[in-house]
């Protein structure tokens, strides 16, 4: 168990725990104090004791010992009074820290005393060698508990230079692979540096005498270190491994390292000392095996095999941990260790080995674990697990502390919980005690709640209530009890309405650049704070101040200017402080594809066959499958910025071999196309030029025709540059008179035409045009027939006659002309005709001529749209490419037809039952007018009751109709007649009904001179005539508001002029009908006294 922080008021004791101790190995130098450290925590206060070499050691009773008087410390210091006092205290120390709950133990502390280092006295004899031989200068420093550093120097304190030939070994000896006369020195001194004592001692100088020789003999390598052929080493896991090979020989050997058993771990291996030393950092199991050094020179080699075994000091797999336990629990302390060789594990309880304890103890040791069942407070103890092998020792202290604590509920009493219907509520009841208290939940009646399967308890005391219902609202009680006491708290639960999304956003597919609107509606518990937010692919969306990308309002999310990056899942999140619901919709943004990202040309050798392979990376399809790829090219030389399609390939294809034209500078691009259209094109490819070739095509549309009577102009459609197949193209033009079988005349030209001069008029020629370039000629061209220049036709068409079809159409016929007289290609006939005048009277106004062009194979034409009852002049001419020949002429007349419609039919109301009709004759008589036909019928009787009668006077312009109904509207139709019958009708609708009602002056206005005023109005069509009064009334004080007598005026007269007005005076004009005031207006006369007449044409009364 673990005592929670909130569990207050119980002062629990603590078993001892070692907090600080001296290192496992302590080397003491002559001048140093000895400090042994051991500190521990615990309640009650901890007592310390020490052992040395397994025997009780009392620091306080030793001379020169200072013990630290501190409640948590058992450390002490020994101060010496002579240089070898430390020898007396050498040994293995251990500290034990105890209180009433148990004993903790420190690891073994090995104290070693190191004396002042001294080189044993020795007589160093001179070393004599012959030049080229090898030699070893020994160092043999005194032994040391701490690592030391060796240096070789001369008497001037200068380091001996080391290289491939001269090397110091790990053992301190100086090795010469072969000596040179320059090595001859009497002062080779070995210095040993002891960092612990901060002292350097030096060996007696060695005198190396080198005898010169005339013939140095080459010899193959031999190992000076190690001397035998193989050796076995143990390397410790995690530690560095150092292997060394030093060889002699002449010339100086070089060293190589090999690992036959596997690869050399390059990241952890370094070679030092001119390759003589191999250092492997952080040895691991995989480094086990054979390592070989090879010393080589030109005469041979020597080798040494190191067999390395990797072992390891003990290390933890699972270290035992201290724990608190309640009565009755099972305590288990795991002690799992590893090492090589496998370590031996021993257990102690309170520092005493378990073997020495009474046999009736309740613990058992099982697979590296110490187990105690049904623990009681009396089982409280500190255990030690110790593991050792030949490389080291591992120790762990761990306590078993059995406590008895009363039950306590750590959750506050009278807490209110709120949750929504259908959700799960969690009522907390965190209880603690030892033994662990039991927890029970009861309802307001004191009954256990667990009878309802919706209620479920957790091990930590929490009560869960799933599928909450409104009637779960209420008070609940939690009861915690153990063998010492029991306690209760109360919890209030309030169940609220769940938030619901009633209409969520819908998945949609939208086009790039458009906008999308998502809507969301939700219902909330009225007592909770509602919120609707939006998320896009899990990110909260907000309206950004500097951008109008998102618009969020009233459960609406609008995303503007859609781009492909906007695609994803959008969700509406409806939430309160108690619950969150989310409704998700997917947005797919579609549009034309992305650009083809990469374009590569390959198989460029095919350019010689006018082919190349184009490959590309697929474009982004933007959610609409790519239907095709369009491959285009541009020729920067001939048509920069102009792209031509070479073809399209299916959308699942990403390469194609293209058929090209010779000598075109091709730059390619590829565009993906889907149903939304083409995307951006790819980056352009490199430019490739196809080799030149002879033309594969000849010009088309070859023609030969003269532009003069004595020449023939040969023209053709020039080849497009992409068909030139070379930098330039020319044209080989050949011609000869048709049917002669004679030799061809020819000329090579660059322009797309050739003029052949001195030809006879209209002679047929055979013509050929062939493309030619630097590589050769195009294919054999086809023969085309051309003609030399034409002359004006001499043929006159002979008229066969004119047939009158009706009053406005005639059929004209003529005989075909003699083609020999055409002097060229008969292109057709020009027919020209014009009206000379009416048969009624001949006008001398401007004559308008009409033309009809008739094809060469036709010898008749219908002339329509003629005016009836008219005289016409007609001409027919044959024409060719040069122009028209002489005309044949003819005159004809059209018969009478029916007239056009009468002009301007007006209805004038005379009374409730009578109307006056007024009209003008038709513009086109089309014959001799014989009179008019008038028809009329009431409108609402659907054409029944039609009345029709002839007015036989062609000069008639008015007609009075009586006996009309004042309540009906009529349709009036008037037609003019000739002997051919009535013509087009003019139609008007009206009657006396609407028109005889309230008077309407329409657009009425007044203008003034100096002594008169004109009032004018527009009478309404068909308005019955009536009479009314006009009254002019002068305004102003000096005029005294004088009125002129009222004047009687007729509506049909359209205007009225009032004379005898005062100059520069304002007048009001009043209009009355049957004593009823109808209209009022104002006018002002001009300011001079001269009389002016009104404009002509105004009626006065």
């Amino acid at each position: 168990i673990q005592i929670p922080e909130e569990y207050e008021g119980h002062h629990v004791m603590e078993p001892p725990v070692i907090t600080e101790q001296s290192p496992r190995r302590l080397v003491v130098f002559p001048t140093d104090d000895i400090s042994l450290k051991c500190e521990a925590s615990g309640k009650p206060e901890v007592q310390f004791r020490w052992t040395r070499d397994g025997v009780h050691f009392k620091p306080k009773e030793e001379l020169g010992v200072t013990v630290y008087q501190s409640p948590h410390s058992g450390s002490f210091t020994i101060t010496g009074n002579n240089s070898n006092f430390a020898q007396r205290f050498q040994g293995i120390y251990r500290c034990f820290a105890s209180n009433k709950l148990g004993t903790a133990m420190s690891h073994e502390i090995r104290l070693m005393a190191e004396g002042a280092p001294k080189w044993p006295k020795e007589t160093v004899k001179p070393v004599e060698v012959e030049e080229g031989e090898s030699v070893v200068l020994p160092c043999n420093p005194p032994p040391s508990a701490e690592p030391l550093r060796i240096y070789w120097m001369n008497s001037k304190i200068l380091h001996i230079k080391q290289d491939e030939r001269v090397t110091m070994g790990q053992n301190g000896n100086l090795y010469f692979a072969n000596v040179l006369t320059s090595d001859n020195h009497s002062d080779y001194i070995c210095h040993a540096h002891f960092p612990g004592t901060r002292t350097i001692i030096q060996k007696e100088p060695i005198d190396l005498r080198v005898k010169a020789t005339n013939s140095m003999i080459d010899r193959k390598p031999r190992l000076l270190f190690p001397t035998n052929s193989s050796s076995h080493l143990v390397a410790l896991q995690g530690q560095p491994l150092v292997l060394e090979c030093i060889a002699e020989g002449f010339p100086t050997p070089t060293i190589k390292w090999l690992r036959p058993s596997g690869p050399m771990p390059a990241d952890r291996v370094t070679y030092q000392n001119h390759n003589k030393t191999l250092q492997l950092l952080k040895v691991g199991e995989e480094d086990d095996g054979e390592y070989r050094c090879l010393a080589e020179n030109s005469l041979g080699s020597a080798r040494h095999a190191y067999y390395v075994t990797v072992e390891a000091a003990p290390y933890w797999l699972h270290k035992p941990q201290s724990h608190l336990y309640g009565p009755g629990e099972t305590a288990r302390l795991d002690c799992q260790v590893q090492g090589r060789p496998q370590p031996e594990v021993t257990w102690r309880i309170n520092g005493i080995p378990v073997e020495e304890l009474a046999k009736d103890q309740k613990y058992r040791i099982q697979r590296g674990a110490l187990i105690l069942s049904n623990v009681q407070p009396s089982d409280t103890m500190v255990t030690q697990c110790e593991a050792r092998n030949r490389h080291g020792l591992l120790l762990a202290n761990a306590y078993i502390y059995v406590v008895q604590l009363p039950a306590k509920i750590l959750t506050a009493d009278n807490q209110t919980y709120m949750a929504v219907q259908g959700s799960t509520a969690y009522l907390l009841c965190k209880a603690f005690g030892a033994p662990v208290p039991s927890v029970q939940w009861l309802d307001e009646d004191g009954t256990t709640v667990l009878q309802d399967e919706r209620f479920f308890p957790y091990a930590n005391g929490t009560l869960g209530i799933r599928d909450l219902q409104a009637n779960d609202t209420g008070r609940y009680f939690c009861l915690a009890a153990n063998d010492q006491n029991n306690v209760t708290i109360m919890a209030n639960l309030k169940v609220k309405d769940a938030t619901q999304i009633t209409q969520g956003p819908r998945s949609t597919i939208e086009k790039k650049g458009s906008r999308v609107t998502f809507t969301c509606q939700a219902s909330f518990d009225p007592s909770l704070q509602p919120s609707i937010t939006w998320r896009g692919d899990g990110r909260d969306l907000q309206e950004l101040g500097d951008s109008d990308k998102y618009f969020i309002e009233d459960g609406r999310l609008v995303i503007h200017s859609l781009d492909y990056s906007d695609q994803g899942n959008y969700s509406c999140v409806a939430s309160t402080e108690l619950d969150v619901v989310e409704s998700r919709a997917q947005l797919l943004v579609v549009g034309s594809p992305g650009p083809v990202p990469r374009l590569v040309l390959s198989d460029l050798h095919l350019l010689t066959q006018s082919q190349v392979r184009v490959s590309w990376s697929p474009a982004e399809d933007h959610n609409a499958p790519i239907e095709k790829y369009d491959i285009e090219f541009e020729d920067k030389e001939m048509a920069p910025e102009k792209w031509y399609s070479l073809g399209k390939v299916p959308g699942n294809q990403t390469s194609t071999t293209l058929k090209l034209s010779p000598y075109v500078h091709y730059t390619f691009r590829v565009t993906a196309i889907n149903k939304y259209g083409p995307g951006e094109p790819s980056p352009v490819s490199e430019t490739v030029v196809t080799p030149e070739a002879a033309p594969e095509k000849n010009p088309v549309d070859v023609k030969g025709e003269g532009n003069e009577t004595t020449n023939m102009v040969i023209t053709w459609k020039p080849l497009r540059w992409m068909d030139w197949n070379a930098p330039q193209v020319q044209y080989r033009v050949q011609w000869r008179p048709q049917g002669t079988r004679g030799p061809w005349q020819e000329q090579i030209v660059s322009d797309p035409f050739l003029v052949v001069s001195n030809t006879s008029t209209f002679v047929p020629y055979e013509i050929k045009v062939q493309a030619v370039n630097s590589q050769g000629k195009g294919p054999e061209p086809q023969v085309t027939i051309g003609y030399s220049g034409e002359d004006y036709p001499q043929a006159i068409p002979e008229l066969e006659g004119i047939e009158i079809l009706n009053s406005s159409a005639v059929l004209v016929k003529w005989r075909p002309v003699d083609l020999a007289q055409v002097k060229g290609h008969l292109r057709g006939y020009n027919v020209t005709y014009w009206r000379e005048g009416s048969q009624r009277k001949h006008s001398k106004r401007h004559i308008h001529k009409d033309h009809v062009v008739v094809p060469a194979n036709t010898t008749s034409v219908i002339l329509s749209g003629l005016r009836p009852y008219s005289s016409y002049h007609l001409e027919v001419q044959a024409f060719n490419g040069r122009g028209s020949g002489p005309a044949s002429e003819f005159t004809f007349s059209t018969p009478e037809g029916v007239p056009g419609h009468p002009e301007a039919l007006h209805l004038e109301c005379q009374s409730n039952t009578s109307l006056l009709l007024r009209w003008q004759p038709p513009l086109s008589h089309n014959g001799v007018l014989t009179g008019y036909v008038l028809s009329y019928h009431p409108l609402d009787e659907g054409g029944k009751g039609q009345l029709s009668f002839n007015l036989r006077d062609p000069e008639l312009r008015t007609h009075n109709l009586t006996d009309l109904s004042p309540h009906l509207r009529y349709r009036f139709q008037l037609q003019a007649t000739t002997k051919e019958g009535p013509g087009e009708a003019i139609v008007r609708e009206g009657g006396t009904m609407a028109l005889s009602g309230i008077s309407d002056f329409g657009n009425i206005s007044a203008t003034a001179g100096e002594n008169y005023s004109v009032v004018s109005w527009v009478p309404k069509e068909g308005q019955c005539n009536f009479r009314f009064h006009i009254l002019f009334k002068a305004l102003g004080e000096e005029k005294g508001g004088a009125s002129l007598s009222p004047q009687y005026v007729s509506y049909n007269q359209s205007s009225y002029t009032q004379w005898d007005l005062q100059p520069d005076t304002d007048y009001e004009i009043h209009l009355f009908k049957e004593r009823m005031f109808r209209h009022q207006m104002a006018v002002k006369t001009n300011g001079t006294g001269r009389v002016r007449l009104p404009p002509a044409g105004f009626a006065t009364e």
Epitope: V600, L601, S602, D603, L604, H605, L606, L607, T608, K636, H665, P683, V684, E686, T687, V688, V689, P691
Partner: antibody, heavy 119, light 107 residues
Framework: QVQLVQSGAEVKKPGSSVKVSCKAS????????IQWVRQAPGQGLEWIGY????????DYAQKFQGRVTLTADESTSTAYMELSSLRSEDTAVYYC????????????WGQGTTVTVSS | DIQMTQSPSSLSASVGDRVTITCRAS??????VAWYQQKPGKVPKLLIY???TLHSGVPSRFSGSGSGTDFTLTISSLQPEDVATYFC?????????FGGGTKVEIK
């Protein structure tokens, strides 16, 4: 006349980067692609990649992918080649060359830039 | 990648001699092969393309032949100024690759 002038020799440490420049004159810079080739001491020629100075589109030999960056500055008619994570085997003379109009050949060459990579 | 193997790696000939250098491609490259000349301390110079087309300004004593995988550069009459290293290059496919070079010296 057409000229390609490269930047001076460089000595670099392994792991560092080098940027070589190539200034073009005597022709319209954007009309011709620039290719880069290198020649290790006493060795043959090795193609590195190309750049289109008008669109800045570039492509590289697989061997150099991820280590080489080709760029161009139209305003100064200069192409650049940057090689990163240098190793001793990158010691070479680096050439820029103008691609012939119409075929992937090299019609004009820069004078070469010696890059030495050594610790 | 297409390998271009050139032989010999070096040759020595007298002034006026006919010199032949060969180049073999690891796969069919049609006639998409070029030859370059690199004089000591100078930059390479284009001599021939499409296996046999002489680049403008190149003396006519230089000629090329071959198609598919085997190609030849011939100097009909060796001149002192022809001392150089000659490289072949394929441009049928990317990456563009060069031969190892043939060093031509005068005896």
């Amino acid at each position: 006349q057409v000229q390609l002038v490269q930047s001076g020799a460089e000595v670099k440490k392994p792991g560092s980067s080098v940027k070589v420049s190539c200034k073009a004159s005597g022709y319209t810079f954007t009309n011709y692609w620039i290719q880069w080739v290198r020649q290790a001491p006493g060795q043959g020629l090795e193609w590195i990649g190309y750049i289109n100075p008008s669109t800045y589109y570039s492509d590289y030999a697989q061997k150099f992918q991820g280590r080489v960056t080709l760029t161009a500055d139209e305003s100064t008619s200069t192409a650049y080649m940057e090689l990163s994570s240098l190793r001793s085997e990158d010691t070479a003379v680096y050439y820029c060359a103008r691609r012939q109009f119409g075929l992937p050949l090299f019609d004009y060459w820069g004078q070469g830039t010696t890059v030495t990579v050594s610790s | 990648d297409i390998q271009m193997t050139q032989s010999p790696s070096s040759l020595s000939a007298s002034v006026g001699d006919r010199v032949t250098i060969t180049c073999r491609a690891s796969q069919d490259v049609g006639t998409a092969v070029a030859w370059y000349q690199q004089k000591p301390g100078k930059v390479p110079k284009l001599l021939i393309y499409w296996a046999s087309t002489l680049h403008s300004g190149v003396p006519s004593r230089f000629s090329g032949s071959g198609s598919g995988t085997d190609f030849t550069l011939t100097i009909s009459s060796l001149q002192p100024e022809d001392v150089a290293t000659y490289f072949c290059q394929q441009y049928s496919n990317y990456p563009l690759t060069f031969g190892g070079g043939t060093k031509v010296e005068i005896k």
